[in-house]
Interface confidence: medium
């Protein structure tokens, strides 16, 4: 049997499309696996073949391209559904081959149903808007290539179930939806419905995305270390447990990596011999500002440990900060009998 480079089932590209709507799906080979495009492959005499495995079946079968009204068709490296049906769900394979070369990849396609308010099991893309930042826009996604530029579709925008018209700070502008000044109250799911004609038929494309209003870069500050601070002293006796929380506030910053770490006498805890554990927790505000807490714990602290320097460090795209914890050994209470004896002039 001839060898074929099989890239397996590409679950990273879990494609979801709505029932009874057009869908155009590009063969992932050219986008993610091969170093050449479809045109190059075609001119080199390679042929692109499509087949599929129905949901809950093991049998690979050819795709029927002879359905009424060309419901499923192929154009270059694109598989078209005009429109999809629920039972089109399955794993689809595109194979590029000639007599000496073969490469193929499979991907899952799920046809999902939506209700009248656009609720569905569809995984929604998230678009982040900065709070109170001036005019920002979202664009109706993934509608390129469905109709030629000569066709003027109608676009209707919804927030949740409600058609957007006469909203205070949200204005539909064709394919774009403009937010004059984004507020927390603008959080939610927004849907654009694009309606266009094709060969005497009318098609609808439904695209829903989640808008999340996040902290504005105008308000962003370097990390703020809330603890340790100058107002708290960790006074311990040898043998006691030492617990020091490092709590840091990070402003939301798009694509910023927030880091918190402890050093003990200038070294990372992993690089020293003390039996130290560090537990981290993270919480977020409504605008995705982040509070990270790392609790440094030494179960049975020694007098040596109490002389060490414990410093919490934090870093974001806005800068780096550090703060030392005030750790000291508890002075033992004076022994009563000795005090009494001294008080009475004993030698």
């Amino acid at each position: 049997s001839e060898r074929c480079d099989d890239w397996g089932l590409d679950t990273m590209r879990q494609i979801q499309v709505f029932e009874d709507e057009p869908a155009r799906i590009k063969c992932p080979l050219f986008e993610h696996f091969l170093k050449f495009n479809y045109s190059t492959a075609h001119s080199a005499g390679l042929t692109l073949i499509w087949y599929w495995t129905r949901q809950d079946r093991d049998l690979e079968e050819p795709i029927n391209f002879r359905l009424p009204e060309n419901r499923i068709s192929k154009e270059k490296d694109v598989l078209w559904f005009r429109p999809t049906l629920l039972n089109d769900t399955g794993n689809y394979t595109c194979m590029l081959r000639n007599t000496t070369y073969c490469s193929k990849v499979a991907f899952p396609l799920e046809v999902v149903q939506k209700d009248s308010c656009f609720n569905s099991p569809m995984k929604l893309p998230v678009h982040k808007l900065y709070i109170e930042y001036g005019i920002q826009r979202i664009t109706c996604p993934n509608v390129d290539g469905y109709f030629p530029s000569s066709v003027k579709p109608t676009i209707t925008w919804y927030m949740g179930c409600y058609k957007i018209q006469n909203f205070n700070n949200v204005i539909p502008e064709g394919m774009n939806l403009s937010f004059l000044i984004a507020l927390i109250s603008n959080n939610g799911n927004y849907t654009c419905v694009v309606t266009y004609p094709e060969n005497g038929r009318t098609f609808h494309l439904t695209r829903t995305l989640t808008v999340k209003v996040v902290g504005s870069p105008k308000n962003a500050v370097p990390p703020v270390i809330h603890s340790p601070n100058d107002h708290v002293v960790y006074e311990k006796e040898p043998g006691e447990e030492l617990l020091i929380p490092c709590t840091v506030y990070f402003s939301f910053l798009m694509d910023s990596r927030n880091e918190v770490w402890w050093t003990i006498d200038g070294k990372k805890p992993d690089d020293i011999t003390i039996d130290v554990t560090i537990n981290e927790s993270i919480s977020h505000s409504r605008t995705e500002d982040e509070t990270r807490t790392q609790i440094l714990s030494i179960k049975k602290v020694t007098s040596e440990d109490l002389k060490r320097s414990y410093v919490c460090h934090a870093r974001s795209a806005k800068g780096e900060v550090a703060k030392a914890a005030k750790v000291k050994q508890k002075v033992p209470a004076p022994r009563y009998t000795v005090e009494l004896a001294c008080g009475f002039g004993a030698t």
Epitope: V224, V232, E235, L243, S281, S285, T291, I295
Partner: antibody, heavy 123, light 112 residues
Framework: QVQLVQSGAEVKKPGASVKVSCKAS????????MNWVRQAPGQGLEWMGQ????????YYAQKFQGRVTMTRDTSTSTVYMELSSLRSEDTAVYYC????????????????WGQGTLVTVSS | DIQMTQSPSSLSASVGDRVTITCRAS??????????MHWYQQKPGKAPKLLIY???DLESGVPSRFSGSGSGTDFTLTISSLQPEDFATYYC??????????FGQGTKLEIK
């Protein structure tokens, strides 16, 4: 969710002491300051002091210095407020309240409160 | 210690009214970028509830008819359109400088 549950009402004689507890749940207990605020009948709110559970560090309002002791038990996520040498004017509802930190280094608000404990001082 | 003067001490208003409560601190409770002034609502027999923190930030879950403003020494709590559930006592609270917190004496908002 964050909850602060306080101990029940107390009746005490003048000169006695009272110890009120506040059990915290739903957050990392040791990382937030806990405050005590009291309210005499028909009066306003009066801040008494605060404790940082991780270290046991305390700050007391001048008025209560020497009479109030705040402690914590990290194993049960509970803070305690003990007020000694009670007098009739200490009759009040005593609240524990968590201090949250928002984006700034200092100047924090009290974001969660216990349900309050009524302490009555009467001979 | 910073003293807080809240006014008025009581106020009668009707549902739908716009209401303003002010709080004056004896010294500034602001620094670059923020003010350590907070507002609470308290209903009879209940614990206070945080409404506004840092002078103007609305606490999560609090209706947007509540707003706060001011900096330095003078601060305002505004209720844009009074609702029946808003009749309560309101307190301002400063937390400037650790570790001394003080509250205003309260404003009792009653139905006219």
């Amino acid at each position: 969710q964050v909850q602060l549950v306080q101990s029940g009402a107390e009746v005490k004689k003048p000169g006695a002491s009272v110890k009120v507890s506040c059990k915290a749940s739903g957050y990392i207990f040791i990382t937030y300051w806990m405050n005590w605020v009291r309210q005499a009948p028909g009066q306003g709110l009066e801040w008494m002091g605060q404790i940082f559970p991780a270290s046991g560090t305390t700050y007391y309002a001048q008025k209560f210095q020497g009479r109030v002791t705040m402690t914590r038990d990290t194993s049960t996520s509970t803070v305690y407020m003990e007020l000694s040498s009670l007098r009739s004017e200490d009759t009040a509802v005593y609240y524990c309240a968590r201090t949250d930190f928002y984006r700034y280094d200092g100047g924090y608000a009290l974001d969660y409160w216990g349900q309050g404990t009524l302490v009555t001082v009467s001979s | 210690d910073i003293q807080m003067t809240q006014s008025p001490s009581s106020l009668s208003a009707s549902v739908g009214d716009r209401v303003t409560i002010t709080c004056r601190a004896s010294q500034s409770v602001s620094t670059s970028g923020y003010s350590s002034m907070h507002w609470y609502q308290q209903k009879p027999g209940k614990a206070p509830k945080l409404l506004i923190y840092y002078a103007s930030d609305l606490e999560s879950g609090v209706p947007s008819r509540f707003s706060g403003s001011g900096s330095g020494t003078d601060f305002t709590l505004t209720i844009s359109s009074l609702q029946p559930e808003d009749f309560a006592t309101y307190y301002c609270h400063h937390s400037w400088g650790i570790p001394m917190y003080t509250f205003g004496q309260g404003t009792k908002l009653e139905i006219k």
